[in-house]
């Protein structure tokens, strides 16, 4: 993990359960030092756009790829489980050229029937010259992308173009968007679930339906749990992310599929092409759209977005700006919580959740999105804690 937002100094890592700091050499060393034992269950991550499996080495105090030698599907499933994915989500494992790695974690097959991490040891060689790549869930795949369209003043999305997009209803009204990340979990914005809408029974999620008029209670999925980021600030909209767990899992098909959560090591470029989607208003102060709309936007550097003529230092590291400084294309009221996605390696990645902006599609007032990259650790922790 990128141990971000920790209260500990650079050299320490925070226990979720107690807030105490522990030495990185005690992290993933086979002995629980945190009261909740989480120092021993956050030892695995997927890195970069190729989903390279990395394991934390307490001796080296750093992350290392896992050598393919003697690796099998069961270990892959165990690693995915440790990240918070359920067994039945498991998609596939692959191998990737070790791409110049000089340091690996290798399996000691003679270690007997012990925990996967106790079987791993540090090695400077990998005879297969390949490292493990893991897909814990088949995510980020859509039918052909939507034609060029806009949320403010544009066209509708094509069926299956944004299969992770959900409409979240309260009182039979579309209130926010959300993104499917597993059959049970939806990412949305924390500002969507501020009191009194923090109660799960207020919410119904609709997936795979493009038109609002086709959404009726019986066709929706009730929400079991609403988890808002503990550091969400309603004034500044900092840490504006929340999770919803559905009462029963979605059935995936061409129109309902998950988006991929970004992996550490994925570098976002300024002006990177992204897409936003939602049923939000198609003009400022307008009504919710009947049909799902989508629009192309560009990422805007935080430094630029924080400039005096744009948002004047209101953008935190937990936020991303996207849109066009000249305006015209933007998310709007009702798009909140919905996805900001980008395509890399033919996979769609959730890099933002629609958060806030000054008006809609105004010049020098681009859309602001929760920076999902900063929250992946928190998301996996919630999924893992839910078991």
């Amino acid at each position: 993990w990128k141990f971000m937002g920790s209260k500990c100094s650079n050299s320490g890592i925070e226990c979720d359960s107690s807030g105490t700091c522990i030495n990185p050499s005690n992290w993933c060393d086979g002995v629980s030092h945190c009261p909740g034992g989480e120092d021993e269950n956050r030892c695995v991550r997927l890195y970069g756009p190729n989903f390279i499996l990395q394991v934390y080495s307490s001796q080296r105090k750093s992350w290392h790829p896992v050598c393919q030698d003697d690796w099998n599907e069961n270990y892959g499933r165990a690693a995915c489980r440790d990240m918070g994915y359920k067994n039945n989500f498991y998609s596939s494992q692959g191998i990737v050229d070790d791409s110049g790695s000089t340091s690996f974690m290798k399996l000691n097959t003679s270690a007997g029937n012990v925990d996967i991490y106790k079987k791993l040891y540090h090695s400077d060689a990998c005879s297969s010259k390949a490292v493990v790549s893991l897909r814990c869930i088949a995510c980020g795949v859509n039918l052909n992308s939507s034609r060029q369209s806009r949320i403010v003043g544009g066209e509708s999305a094509l069926p299956g173009a944004w299969p992770w997009q959900v409409s979240l209803h309260v009182q039979n009204v579309h209130v926010c968007g959300g993104s499917i990340i597993t059959p049970e979990w939806i990412v949305t914005a924390a500002h969507c679930v501020e009191k009194p809408l923090n109660n799960p029974w207020h919410w119904t999620a609709f997936a795979g339906i493009l038109r609002q008029s086709f959404m009726f209670y019986g066709a929706g999925y009730q929400v079991e749990k609403v988890i808002s980021h503990p550091n969400y600030d309603s004034k500044t909209k900092n840490n504006d992310i929340a999770l919803m767990k559905l009462q029963k899992p979605l059935t995936f098909n061409d129109l309902v599929k998950p988006v991929c959560l970004p992996n550490p090591g994925m570098m976002l470029q300024p002006e990177q092409l992204c897409w936003i989607s939602g049923w939000g208003a198609t003009e400022e102060k307008g009504k919710t759209s009947e049909v799902l709309n989508a629009a192309k936007v560009l990422l805007i550097e935080t430094q630029r977005c924080n400039s005096r003529y744009v948002y004047d230092n209101l953008i935190t590291p937990a936020m991303i700006c996207a849109g066009f400084l000249q305006g015209n294309v933007d998310s709007c009221q009702g798009d909140s919580g919905g996805p900001l996605v980008t395509s890399k390696n033919n996979i769609w990645w959730l890099i933002g959740d629609t958060s806030w902006g000054s008006g809609c599609a105004k010049a020098y007032r681009p859309g602001v999105y929760g920076n999902v990259m900063v929250f992946t650790d928190w998301i996996y922790r919630q999924m893992r804690a839910d078991g």
Partner: antibody, heavy 117, light 112 residues
């Protein structure tokens, strides 16, 4: 049509427990939250708690947390409420009701619970 | 906790008369996101279970006669029966679902 069937009456002794049932029919039981409501003789309505039949997720009125326990049996489309350590104060009519959005659109006929030695 | 207060606690009217009853909440029940109120009205006839009349403060449940009208927003709500019929003899309860669920004490309607 939607129906919530509850037994008409239950007679139990003080200190005992009772499990009240609410059998749902005419709709997808696992899609809708189910509520329980109490009405003491000649009194108003009091909300006890809520359960989702698919996951078993519950939430209770603080007042009833140590008194009531909500469960479901998906196979028979039945919701249950167990009431423990019964006293005469628990004598009341207990209703189950289905939640649609945020209102109770269908109610059971109610079970009259009498706690008496 | 949100407290729901209903008034009057009882009233007696003749058939054909117009009736209004009030329900006040200790805090606003308006959902700013949907612009709907988390308030419903229920009718309970003697010996029967409650029946939904009005939800979201002013939306009439299907099958409910149009003489029943709900109005109000925020903290003050009213149920109006434009021309009372003998079968309207019942206790009427308001209920909030803004924060968990609370019923008002009820208004008993009697027919003279």
């Amino acid at each position: 049509q939607v129906q919530l069937q509850q037994p008409g009456a239950e007679l139990v002794k003080p200190g005992a427990s009772v499990k009240l049932s609410c059998k749902a029919s005419g709709y997808s039981f696992t899609t809708y939250w189910m509520h329980w409501v109490r009405q003491r003789p000649g009194q108003g309505l009091e909300w006890i708690g809520i359960i989702h039949p698919n996951s078993g997720t519950t939430n209770y009125n603080e007042k009833f947390k140590s008194k009531a326990s909500l469960t479901v049996d998906k196979s028979s489309s039945t919701a249950y409420m167990q009431l423990s350590s019964l006293t005469s104060e628990d004598s009341a009519v207990y209703y189950c009701a289905r939640l649609l959005w945020d209102y109770f659109d269908y109610w059971g006929q109610g079970t009259t619970l009498t706690v008496s030695s | 906790d949100i407290v729901m207060s209903q008034s009057p606690s009882s009233l007696a009217v003749s058939a054909g008369e117009k009736v209004t009853m009030s329900c006040k909440s200790s805090q606003s029940l308006l959902n700013s996101r949907t612009r709907k109120n988390f308030l419903a009205w229920y009718q309970q006839k003697p010996g029967q279970s409650p029946k939904l009349l009005i939800y979201w403060a002013s939306t009439r449940e299907s099958g409910v006669p149009d003489r029943f009208t709900g109005s109000g927003s925020g903290t003050d709500f009213t149920l109006t029966i434009s021309s009372v019929q003998a079968e309207d003899l019942a206790v009427y309860y308001c209920k909030q679902s803004y924060n968990l669920y609370t019923f008002g004490g009820g208004t008993k309607l009697e027919i003279k």
